[in-house]
């Protein structure tokens, strides 16, 4: 499966569209997950509505939003207020029971705004950063938020 590389500017939104065969994936929920390693687990960020007929409704987790057009066969993920910590390799998945079929691999590259005076050596993930489904999120004393990635796939 080829990897699609998408670039986004820090502070802006990035929209990802994953297309699929609407007939083949009829009745299946979709998910967006972050791959923690080359052969490691893919930690779910957000998934579409539990009721498939309502998959068109936007579902949000932190700054990540997902919606599925099941007739057109397009699931759209929006990463809002993109931050350096959002960079990574993600998967669009089609869920069937406990199985997850990879629809697309997406490498998200976050570019710093060259006009921004912020210290580019300090890549804090800010308070608005998205958390992960089922993940514990602890606030530290600095202005970042440490997001946990449990080792579940």
């Amino acid at each position: 499966l080829n990897t699609t590389v998408l670039q986004g500017m820090a502070g802006q939104s990035l929209r990802v569209s994953c297309t699929y065969d609407a007939l083949k994936h009829w009745g299946r929920r979709k998910a967006w997950c972050r791959q923690l390693g080359e052969e490691g687990p893919c930690q779910r960020v957000v998934s579409t509505h539990g009721v498939w007929l309502l998959a068109f409704l936007k579902k949000r987790n932190g700054s990540t939003v997902i919606a599925d057009d099941t007739l057109a066969g397009t699931v759209t993920i929006t990463l809002k207020n993109l931050q350096a910590g959002d960079a990574g390799l993600y998967q669009c998945q089609s869920l069937r029971g406990r199985e997850a079929e990879v629809l697309q691999k997406v490498l998200v590259e976050v570019l710093e705004d060259p006009l921004d005076d912020q210290d580019a050596g300090d890549l804090w993930v800010p308070e608005e950063s998205s958390s992960f489904e089922g993940a514990q999120v602890e606030h530290s004393t600095s202005r970042n938020q440490e997001t946990s990635f449990p080792p579940t796939s």
Epitope: V5, G37, S140, E146, S148, P150
Partner: antibody, heavy 119, light 107 residues
Framework: EVQLVESGGGLVQPGRSLKLSCAAS????????MAWVRQAPTKGLEWVAS????????YYRDSVKGRFTLSRDNAKSTLYLQMDSLRSEDTATYYC????????????WGQGVMVTVSS | NIVMTQSPKSMSLSVGDRVTMNCKAS??????LAWYQQKPGQSPKLLLY???NRFTGVPDRFTGGGYGTDFTLTINSVQAEDAAFYYC?????????FGGGTKLELK
């Protein structure tokens, strides 16, 4: 098999420049963040700088900011570290590393190249 | 910057022993931690990422645990080839900082 081969190290006087290169093979270079990590003699590891997969953004540790420049040539699968205004405290073995998708951990390392800054 | 402190500085064990080394972060880092092994004269090698995920080819005698500020690397039944320096590293949020290392020697 992932391979990272560094070159360009050597002995240099304080205030002078040196350019390190890292030739990568065994993976799609343009799909990966890359970084340099250094290790002073008999000391621990120290992250130096990282670069996004396209080279669009670079990040440096405070002590090298303004002196070191990280760049890449995706067509040649090569990473570069231009080191200017070198100081004695920059003396170290410099490792070229592949950084996993912006996560800040380094899954593959080169053999390292020694940089000695001394008069 | 978050400081990573490793303990003990060094330890000497026999083949077959179970060893646990520690890494303490000065602030909460969630489970954003990696461990590396560096044998004498060699480059570091990734062992574990996000606290407990073993990297490709790493034997299952290496296990990681902890959360927040306190982390452990455990080697069940130490082998002669495990003699090395072990470094922890705070990941996910830069600047990426390493601990000072723990030296594991075999008797």
């Amino acid at each position: 098999e992932v391979q990272l081969v560094e070159s360009g190290g050597g002995l240099v006087q304080p205030g002078r420049s040196l350019k390190l290169s890292c030739a990568a093979s065994g993976f799609t270079f343009s799909n990966y963040y890359m970084a340099w990590v250094r290790q002073a003699p008999t000391k621990g590891l120290e992250w130096v700088a990282s670069l996004t997969n396209s080279g669009g953004s670079t990040y440096y540790r405070d002590s090298v900011k303004g002196r070191f420049t990280l760049s890449r040539d995706n067509a040649k699968s090569t990473l570069y570290l231009q080191m200017d205004s070198l100081r004695s405290e920059d003396t170290a073995t410099y490792y070229c590393t592949r950084e996993w998708a912006g996560s800040g951990y380094f899954d593959y390392w080169g053999q390292g190249v020694m940089v000695t800054v001394s008069s | 910057n978050i400081v990573m402190t490793q303990s003990p500085k060094s330890m000497s064990l026999s083949v077959g022993d179970r060893v646990t080394m520690n890494c303490k972060a000065s602030q909460n880092v969630g489970n954003n931690l990696a461990w590396y092994q560096q044998k004498p004269g060699q480059s570091p090698k990734l062992l574990l990422y996000y606290t407990s995920n073993r990297f490709t080819g790493v034997p299952d005698r290496f296990t990681g645990g902890g959360y927040g500020t306190d982390f452990t690397l455990t080697i069940n039944s130490v082998q002669a080839e495990d003699a090395a320096f072990y470094y922890c590293q705070r990941i996910y949020n830069s600047p990426w900082t390493f601990g000072g290392g723990t030296k594991l020697e075999l008797k």
